[in-house]
Amino acid sequence: SGVFQLQLQEFINERGVLASGRPCEPGCRTFFRVCLKHFQAVVSPGPCTFGTVSTPVLGTNSFAVRDDSSGGGRNPLQLPFNFTWPGTFSLIIEAWHAPGDDLRPEALPPDALISKIAIQGSLAVGQNWLLDEQTSTLTRLRYSYRVICSDNYYGDNCSRLCKKRNDHFGHYVCQPDGNLSCLPGWTGEYCQQPICLSGCHEQNGYCSKPAECLCRPGWQGRLCNECIPHNGCRHGTCSTPWQCTCDEGWGGLFCDQDLNYCTHHSPCKNGATCSNSGQRSYTCTCRPGYTGVDCELELSECDSNPCRNGGSCKDQEDGYHCLCPPGYYGLHCEHSTLSCADSPCFNGGSCRERNQGANYACECPPNFTGSNCEKKVDRCTSNPCANGGQCLNRGPSRMCRCRPGFTGTYCELHVSDCARNPCAHGGTCHDLENGLMCTCPAGFSGRRCEVRTSIDACASSPCFNRATCYTDLSTDTFVCNCPYGFVGSRCEFPVGLPPSFPW
């Protein structure tokens, strides 16, 4: 689609005569008829296939024709066409005499023709005017012409439609050849595809407008390059959405079970060595001089009563020192200079001579011990408390302080792991020596029967366009992870593409 423009510039008819030579009366009141048609080697009569246009009376006899385009006037003359410009044409320009104001052919004199010119040739689409002048015996016409494309048409023959737009169907302006030039931030054949935020992940992110980065289900972060782990994942990470890959030292479906209590909590004090011994379970190996479950108690070297025969113990920086009673000597007062004659046995102990009276031994009554029966029996010396329990003397009896997870007089019993009802969905709990086991009802599985196996939301392949399906364990629903170019809960919609185009 385009316009053939004809700019009449000057018409000379000095004698004021018609083509026949007859003078115009009172003068040649001149108007023009223009016929544009297909190329003919010899321009012949017939339909004006490309269009026709007439002017009003522009002047009398000889006159210049002013450019009236700026005021919306008729010069240049416009001959619009609604087809591909063929590059060739034939043009007939007739000058007519109209004695009155009625320019209809039947209202003109029988001999009203002042002049007619016919030209033909090639004409390319362009902004430049071609100037021409046609002279006959009595008249001269100077004019110029050109072909330009209509609004929104481009190319060598005005056949390429391009209408700039900035809406859902495209964001572009038109180049001189009719090709689209995308507005900043848009790309694609019709400039419908927004250019997402720089760095936005190609597969996991998308955008509906430029410089945006919207994440597909299962992804997060400014550039949608961080996966979203399973809902409730505590100490775990993911490489694909809805995973929960446990950090070192953590276990369980949600990585909330502490398998490395030692590292995470450092329970052992005073430089003790910590050993993991199960979920939330540990053992502290104390350095010399410390005791307690967590080696939190400072141990005096004298607490073990190393001095015998009634010797008194004195703590020192580098150990201890025994002050022996009369008749004894040695590091622990273990050597005696006494005999039974000296009544060395205390607390009702019986003395027995040894080595021909050079030595003796005391036989102690119950609750007393020591070489001279000088010590009350310490019921904790035999380490009666099992599973790392701490033994405490309580007068004539003793008591075990048990570590978490154990009970009983001697801490010999595991606290029942089943007491907390850890098995979900009606699972049956069984205590084991080193933990527990759940027997799950039909339709459930997992260490705690927390996984619903009877409903696989992805089994029906609900995701389109080769999307990846994930089952959300907490809601028994599915989540589709769309490939690049698709969106929607089932990845059923191509990104940005409307169902049809208006052109």
Epitope: V17, L18, A19, S20, G21, R22, P23, E25, S44, P45, G46, W96, P99, R104, P105, E106, A107, L108, P109, P110, D111, A112, L113, S115, K116, S136, T137
Partner: antibody, heavy 119, light 106 residues
Amino acid sequence: EVQLVESGGGVVQPGRSLRLSCAASGFTFRSHWMSWVRQAPGKGLEWVADISQDGSYKYYADSVKGRFTISRDNSKNTLYLQMNSLRAEDTAVYYCARAAGGNVGFDIWGQGTMVTVSS
Amino acid sequence: SYELTQPPSVSVSPGQTASITCSADKLGTKYVSWYQQKPGQSPVLVIYQDGNRPSGIPERFSGSNSGNTATLTISGTQAMDEADYYCQSWDQSGAVFGGGTKLTVL
């Protein structure tokens, strides 16, 4: 139906006068130029005269100039040709014709009326 | 005065193309009309403004005008086309007719 009907022809002596009439019907007479064209026996067509819509412009062939007068009565839709000083060479069939505007030519013709100038 | 020259006669076989010429100086700058006249009848306009056909005129009639010559062409000539043909234009005094051409369909 568009129609032109001539009348007034006949035999006349040289030097005498004759008035031809042409009755128009079927079109708007006052909107058209009208003409007279004659054809001598066995010869070609010859334009005689024409007249503008309101009668303000009249043109004549050199051969009849000063002797013939073209006129019209738009109220009667009638065209006239007053022929004076007739000559033998004026003998012909005289046609009334509508002269279409804009160099179309004569698009409607009457059946013609014969004028014979003879002594 | 301005003279339009036509050949006195042209013959053509039925179904063939007949061409009748009309010559004058710089005739191509003017418009030419053509008339058909059969014996005992009034003339009929068959071509105006060089090559336009009035309504009712068969398509086999066409015309052209270039340079010094105008041409009436009858393609597929029929017996009913046998007649006298006149070209017509205008000069400073008024309408001018050619001498006429008798078309004979053999």
